[in-house]
């Protein structure tokens, strides 16, 4: 885990300062409003299953 | 550290009723989705139900073989989880463990608390 | 509902082996960038522990002898050289879709 203004998180994760620690990319699939997915790539729209399982 | 302290479990005859707590520390409760996963007596884990968010209007999941039965809460403002399991089975009987996680993988788990359900 | 199958079941091998476990999923669990596959590390009478989620990300303190990789539906875990305290049983899990379902796991016993 790192603070803002250090180096940047590893790949594949992105800072959240909501958490204040870095988080996975990935789970913006689940998670698509978080914070740190502004911080990823693409940040894939979470499909109807995890709406409307 | 991260705490997640299970209670509620015991015997319990076949039909009946019980409430298991999980009292849950050292990270954003309100931010983490929670579950409840069973493991019978020398088999594999079991996920058994799901609570999401305040923001997803604390949207809940549960496996078929719960459904109806069973039904999962949170009190944010106590920083616990609950489950209510009603109409209980001999198939029920099993270690419940809590979990929480940001998203996909189970980061945090209890001890356990071991529901017997037996006449 | 996603099957998902791991092999072994059970396992003999000694301090300083290289075991490998594989996860079958019944149908994809990936993305093009992420897969949704996680492993778990139990031992006797303990909760679970999350060793790798997203199929190779190793989990803070997790040591670097534990490896993942894999996508679509074939997945290992990987122990380049086994110690007294990796003797565990070890399930995979999937969070594709509800339900998440674990693999029957994979017993890690002392040859």
């Known amino acids: 885990e790192q603070a803002p203004g250090t180096a940047p998180c590893s790949r594949g994760s992105s800072w959240s300062a909501d958490l204040d620690k870095c988080m996975d990319c990935a789970s913006c699939r689940a998670r698509p409003h978080s914070d740190f997915c502004l911080g990823c790539a693409a940040a894939p729209p979470a499909p109807f299953r995890l709406l409307w399982p | 550290q991260v705490e997640l302290v299970e209670s509620g479990g015991g015997l319990v005859q076949p039909g009946g009723s019980l409430r298991l707590s999980c009292a849950a520390s050292g990270f954003t409760f309100s931010s983490y989705w929670m579950s409840w996963v069973r493991q019978a007596p020398g088999k594999g884990l079991e996920w058994v139900a799901e609570?999401?968010?305040?923001?997803?209007?604390?949207?809940?999941h549960y496996a078929e073989s719960v459904k109806g039965r069973f039904t999962i809460s949170r009190d944010d403002s106590k920083n616990s989880l609950y489950l209510q399991m009603n109409s209980l089975r001999a198939e029920d009987t099993a270690v419940y463990y809590c979990?929480?996680?940001?998203?996909?993988?189970?980061?945090?788990w209890g001890q356990g608390t071991l529901v017997t359900v037996s006449s | 509902d996603i099957q998902m199958t791991q092999s072994p079941s059970s396992l003999s091998a000694s301090v300083g082996d290289r075991v490998t476990i594989t996860c079958r999923a019944s149908?994809?669990?990936?993305?093009?960038?992420?897969?949704?596959m996680h492993w778990y590390q139990q031992k006797p009478g303990k909760a679970p522990k999350l060793l790798i989620k997203y199929a190779s990300n190793l989990e803070s303190g997790v040591p670097s002898r534990f490896s993942g990789s894999g996508s679509g539906t074939d997945f290992t875990l990987t122990i380049s050289s086994l110690q007294p305290e990796d003797f565990a049983t070890y399930y995979c899990?999937?969070?594709?879709?509800?339900?998440?379902?674990f693999g029957g796991g994979t017993k890690v016993e002392i040859k």
């Open positions: 979990t929480g996680y940001y998203a996909d993988a189970m980061d945090y």
């Open positions: 609570i999401r968010l305040k923001s997803d209007n604390y949207a809940t």
């Open positions: 899990q999937h969070s594709w879709e509800i339900p998440y379902t």
């Open positions: 149908q994809s669990v990936s993305t093009s960038s992420y897969s949704y």
